[in-house]
C-alpha cells in the first residue's frame, strides 16, 4: 500500500490555521465535507462538517473551526482560529458520499501548535492574531454519524496521469483510487 | 489510457455550419468537463468554450469570438463532447482541439489530435 | 477577461544554458494561495502537452529541468539546462476565471 502523506503546519498558540482540501471534481462540488481529527489507535473523529448539500461559500462554524466550500474552484478552506497546543495532532477532510464510505481528500494535515505567540506572522504562516473576527452569517450544521466494519483500505498508486505530482489532484471516478475511512463522531 | 479524437472537420463557406465531434475513451467520461481550444495557422492558442458535468447542469461557458454563433453540448452515454459552429467566419479557420481537464478549473492534462476548419468561399 | 501577456515573444538559448519566460496577468490568477495558471510545451504539428500546473506544480513524466514560479500576477517557468528536444512554442494559461485564457505564446530557439 502507498504511504499516506502528510502536510506539517507548525504554529503558535493563538493563531489561526488555514487550509484548504481540495476535491476536484463537480461531482462531489453539492456532497457534505467534513473536518477530522485521527488519534492514535482511534477512528477518526469529526469535528465539523458542512450543510447537506454543501452550500457555495457559506461559512459553518463550529466552535473555533469555520468550513467554506468554495463550489466553483473545488476547494474546502477550513480554518482553525485561536490555536490552543492541545490541538495538536492529525487532520484530514472527508467527503461523505452515504450510502458509500467517505472519501479521505489528500493530504492529511499534522498540525503542531507551541506555546507563546510569535507576534507578527510571517506571510506564509496563514495565521492571524489572537482576536478573529467571526464572520456575521456563519451556520452550524449537523454532522452525520457514520460506522463501518471495515479498516483503512488503500489502493496501489495509479500509474496513469490522473494522479499529478506533488499535490496529488486525485482522480476518484473509481473505488479502488480512493482511501476508503470508516468515520465514527 | 486516456484518448480524445476529434472529427467533422473540413471546408465550410463563410455563414455555413459544421459540428465537430469529440469521442473520449479511457476515463469517466460524465465525470469531467470537456473544453475546446482552437489554434489559427501560425497562431497562439485561443480557449473556445467549455461544457460541466450533470452535476453542474452541463453549464457551458464561451469566449467573446465565439458567444452567440458556437454550442458545446455532449452525450455521456456516447462519451462525446460536440461543438456546433454556426454562422462561420473566415477567422474561425484554425485546428479545433478538444481538451480534457483534471476538475474544476484544473489544467488541461489531456488533448485530441485536432481537426481542421477551414471557412473560406 | 483576464489578459495574459508573455515575455519575450522569442527567445534564443545556447544549449545548455538557462530559459526564462515570464507570464504577466492583467488581473489576479490566484484563488486563496492557489495560482490557476499552468504552462503547456507545443511542438509544431502537435497538440499541446502540459508542462506546469497551478504555477509550480511538474506535471508527471516532464522532466525536472522545467519549473514554475510565482503567484498572483507574475509568473515564470524556467528551463534550468536545454535541450534540444526543448525547441518549441510555450503558453501559459489560466484557468481562475472564466472566459479561461492563454497567452500568446513564446518561441524558443536554440542559439
Known amino acids: 500500500a502507498t504511504k499516506l502523506t502528510e502536510e506539517k503546519y507548525e504554529l503558535k498558540e493563538g493563531q489561526t490555521l488555514d487550509v484548504k482540501c481540495d476535491y476536484t471534481l463537480e461531482k462531489f462540488a453539492s456532497s457534505q465535507k467534513a473536518w477530522q481529527i485521527i488519534r492514535d489507535g482511534e477512528m477518526p473523529k469529526t469535528l465539523a462538517c458542512t450543510e447537506r448539500p454543501s452550500k457555495n461559500s457559506h461559512p459553518v462554524q463550529v466552535g473555533r473551526i469555520i468550513l467554506e466550500d468554495y463550489h466553483d474552484h473545488g476547494l474546502l478552506r477550513v480554518r482553525m482560529v485561536n490555536l490552543q497546543v492541545e490541538d495538536s495532532g492529525l487532520y484530514q477532510c472527508v467527503i461523505y458520499q452515504p450510502p458509500k464510505e467517505p472519501h479521505m481528500l489528500f493530504d492529511r494535515i499534522r498540525l503542531v501548535v507551541t506555546k507563546g505567540f510569535s507576534g507578527t506572522p510571517g506571510s506564509n504562516e496563514n495565521s492571524t492574531q489572537n482576536v478573529y473576527k467571526i464572520p456575521p452569517t456563519t451556520t452550524k450544521a449537523l454532522c452525520p454519524l457514520y460506522t463501518s466494519p471495515r479498516t483503512v483500505t488503500q489502493a496501489p498508486p495509479k500509474s496513469t496521469a490522473d494522479v499529478s505530482t506533488p499535490d496529488s489532484e486525485i482522480n476518484l471516478t473509481n473505488v479502488t483510487d480512493i482511501i476508503r475511512v470508516p468515520v465514527f463522531n | 489510457e486516456v484518448q480524445l479524437v476529434e472529427s467533422g472537420g473540413g471546408l465550410v463557406q463563410p455563414g455555413g455550419s459544421l459540428k465537430l465531434s469529440c469521442a473520449a475513451s479511457?476515463?469517466?467520461?460524465?465525470?469531467?468537463?470537456m473544453h475546446w481550444v482552437r489554434q489559427a495557422s501560425g497562431k497562439g492558442l485561443e480557449w473556445v468554450g467549455r461544457?460541466?458535468?450533470?452535476?453542474?447542469?452541463?453549464?457551458?461557458y464561451y469566449a467573446a469570438s465565439v458567444k452567440g454563433r458556437f454550442t458545446i453540448s455532449r452525450d455521456d452515454s456516447k462519451n462525446t463532447a460536440y461543438l456546433q459552429m454556426n454562422s462561420l467566419k473566415t477567422e474561425d479557420t484554425a485546428v479545433y482541439y478538444c481538451?480534457?481537464?483534471?476538475?474544476?478549473?484544473?489544467?488541461?492534462?489531456?488533448w485530441g489530435q485536432g481537426t481542421l476548419v477551414t471557412v473560406s468561399s | 477577461d483576464i489578459v495574459l501577456t508573455q515575455s519575450p515573444d522569442s527567445l534564443a538559448v545556447s544549449l545548455g544554458e538557462r530559459a526564462t519566460i515570464n507570464c504577466r496577468a492583467s488581473?489576479?490568477?490566484?484563488?486563496?494561495?492557489?495560482?490557476?495558471l499552468h504552462w503547456y510545451q507545443q511542438k509544431p504539428g502537435q497538440p499541446p502537452k502540459l508542462l506546469i500546473y497551478?504555477?509550480?506544480n511538474l506535471e508527471s513524466g516532464v522532466p525536472d529541468r522545467f519549473s514554475g514560479s510565482g503567484s498572483g500576477t507574475d509568473f515564470t517557468l524556467t528551463i534550468s539546462s536545454l535541450q534540444a528536444e526543448d525547441v518549441a512554442v510555450y503558453y501559459c494559461?489560466?484557468?481562475?476565471?472564466?472566459?479561461?485564457?492563454f497567452g500568446q505564446g513564446t518561441k524558443l530557439e536554440i542559439k
Open positions: 481538451t480534457r481537464d483534471m476538475g474544476i478549473r484544473r489544467q488541461f492534462a489531456y
Open positions: 461544457i460541466r458535468t450533470k452535476s453542474s447542469n452541463y453549464a457551458t
Open positions: 479511457g476515463f469517466t467520461f460524465s465525470t469531467y468537463a
Open positions: 494559461q489560466q484557468s481562475n476565471e472564466d472566459p479561461y485564457t
Open positions: 497551478r504555477a509550480s
Open positions: 488581473q489576479s490568477v490566484d484563488t486563496f494561495d492557489y495560482s490557476f
